[in-house]
């Protein structure tokens, strides 16, 4: 954690372990409201290393949804829509945070996790060509 | 949130607007370890869409340190090296949650806040307007 | 049931010129990535040819481009392998193999093969 | 093209012994391996795909595992029926290319 001079208007801790229990408020502040998010939803088909969603549901988890990208080819597609050989599709990940609730089905207690998800698909050249 | 039977073992929450604020253990459990988040690290280069990472760091944020990507080019890398303006290089956008402090610079206090981030750019066909 | 048979193997002479045939059953073969597969007697596998579920996409590796060319007819079933100017290092058992995608990355189902013996 | 080094190229077991052979890469094929199984005169039998991922009837004492550049396969429980050659194949990069093959022996 980052330390932090403590605010004088900051809520008190009760926690002896504090800062490693800290309190949330879960009424989330959405910062995108200038960006589209649905802008970039075509992109899975459009691409050259398209990908399908799935959906990965788990209600001990905030949240509780998460969409998973699989690429649909192992190679990448090519103007015709025929498969490049010389080139490969991959999924491009990211860690990400998620709330689990601890102990199990508690609705006001939860620990931070990082789960690493499939964000979408990208087309990349499978070798490194080293420059003598 | 997700109406679940409270478990007799959840800690108490005196808060009035319970579960609007909820308690949450910041001892990160990674679910990663069977993936090596590292392995993809290369994509950004050898992509047909290369990017670029930028540092975003915000100490009001958990956490703190966020990497944005940039595509290189508006149009896509081909065989050769040269950009093939008939493609598009496009971000792959994504909402994750992170924490923000509040009141600002409180140690132990956040709430939890969802923000876009572009994780990597992918290559895809533009979308061609017929005009009638 | 899934079934591939593979005909046309023979003795060549070098130089010579041999058209192998796969039959395909048990599976929409139009959906389907098709490769060809060799193993030398006594020796391990190669890849010969790959061609996708529509016959737009192929690739050879440098030991057979240019001499070999494969090709398929969806509505015969059928996989084939044009092989011209053959030498003696193209004496080998012939697979012929399904990819369980459309494009022919791996291989979940081998046809019995056939034996192409080229010599003088 | 991608070179694939199996090793051992043969190995001497007993049924029941718990066998591993492995397949290292010239270069990171990032996952995308799969193992084969041929008994003589016979085609190949895929057994593992994606380096992890079992196929579809393929007995449950088999299991693929690794990455980068370097993989295994790995029998728990040698049976009569596994005597055989096993092959990895890489398809990261065309040509896809396969390893010198091992075989299984009875000891």
């Known amino acids: 954690g980052i330390a932090i001079p403590r605010n004088s208007g900051c809520p008190n801790s009760e926690d002896k372990n504090f800062p490693r229990t800290v309190m949330v408020n879960l009424n989330i502040h959405n910062r995108n409201t200038s960006t589209n998010p649905k802008r970039s939803s075509d992109y899975y088909n459009r691409s050259t290393s398209p990908w399908n969603l799935h959906r990965n549901e788990d209600p001990e988890r905030y949240p509780s949804v998460i969409w998973e990208a699989k690429c649909r080819h192992l190679g990448c597609v090519k103007a015709d829509g025929n498969v490049d050989y010389h080139m490969n599709s991959v999924p491009i990940q990211q860690e990400i945070l998620v709330l689990r609730r601890e102990p199990r089905h508690c609705p006001n207690s939860f620990r931070l996790e990082k789960i690493l998800v499939s964000v979408g698909c990208t087309c990349v050249t499978p070798i490194v060509h080293h420059v003598a | 949130g997700i109406a679940i039977p409270r478990n007799s073992g959840c800690p108490n929450s005196e808060d009035k607007n319970f579960p609007r604020t909820v308690m949450v253990n910041l001892n990160i459990h990674n679910r990663n370890t069977s993936t090596n988040p590292k392995r993809s690290s290369d994509y950004y280069n050898r992509s047909t869409s290369p990017w670029n990472l930028h540092r975003n760091e915000d100490p009001e944020r958990y956490p703190s340190v966020i990497w944005e990507a940039k595509c290189r080019h508006l149009g896509c890398v081909k065989a050769d090296g040269n950009v093939d303006y008939h493609m598009n290089s496009v971000p792959i956008q994504q909402e994750i949650l992170v924490l923000r402090r509040e009141p600002r610079h409180c140690p132990n206090s956040f709430r939890l806040e969802k923000i876009l981030v572009s994780v990597g750019c992918t290559c895809v066909t533009p979308i061609v307007h017929h005009v009638a | 049931e899934v079934q591939l048979v593979e005909s046309g193997g023979g003795l060549v002479q070098p130089g010579g010129s041999l058209r192998l045939s796969c039959a395909a059953s048990g599976f929409t073969f139009s959906t389907y990535g098709m490769s060809w597969v060799r193993q030398a007697p006594g020796k391990g596998l190669e890849l010969v040819a790959i061609i996708n579920h529509n016959g737009g996409s192929t690739f050879y590796p440098d030991s057979v481009k240019g001499r070999f060319t494969v090709s398929r007819d969806n509505s015969k079933n059928t996989l084939y392998l044009q092989m011209n100017s053959l030498r003696a290092e193209d004496t080998a058992v012939y697979y012929c193999?399904?990819?369980?995608?459309?494009?022919?990355?791996?291989?979940?189902?081998w046809g019995q093969g056939t034996l192409v013996t080229v010599s003088s | 093209d991608i070179q694939m080094t199996q090793s051992p190229s043969s190995l001497s077991a007993s049924v029941g012994d718990r066998v591993t052979i492995t397949c290292r890469a010239s270069?990171?094929?990032?996952?995308?391996l799969a193992w084969y199984q041929q008994k003589p005169g016979k085609a190949p039998n895929l057994l593992v795909s994606?380096?992890?991922s079992l196929e579809s009837g393929v007995p449950s004492r088999f299991s693929g595992s690794g990455s980068g550049k370097d993989y295994t396969l790995t029998i728990s429980s040698l049976q009569p029926e596994d005597f055989a050659t096993y092959y990895c194949?890489?398809?990261?990069?065309?040509?896809?290319?396969f390893g010198g093959g091992t075989k299984v022996e009875i000891k």
């Open positions: 270069e990171d094929i990032y996952d995308r």
């Open positions: 193999a399904r990819d369980p995608r459309h494009d022919g990355y791996f291989f979940d189902y």
């Open positions: 994606g380096a992890t």
């Open positions: 194949q890489q398809y990261w990069s065309v040509p896809w290319t």
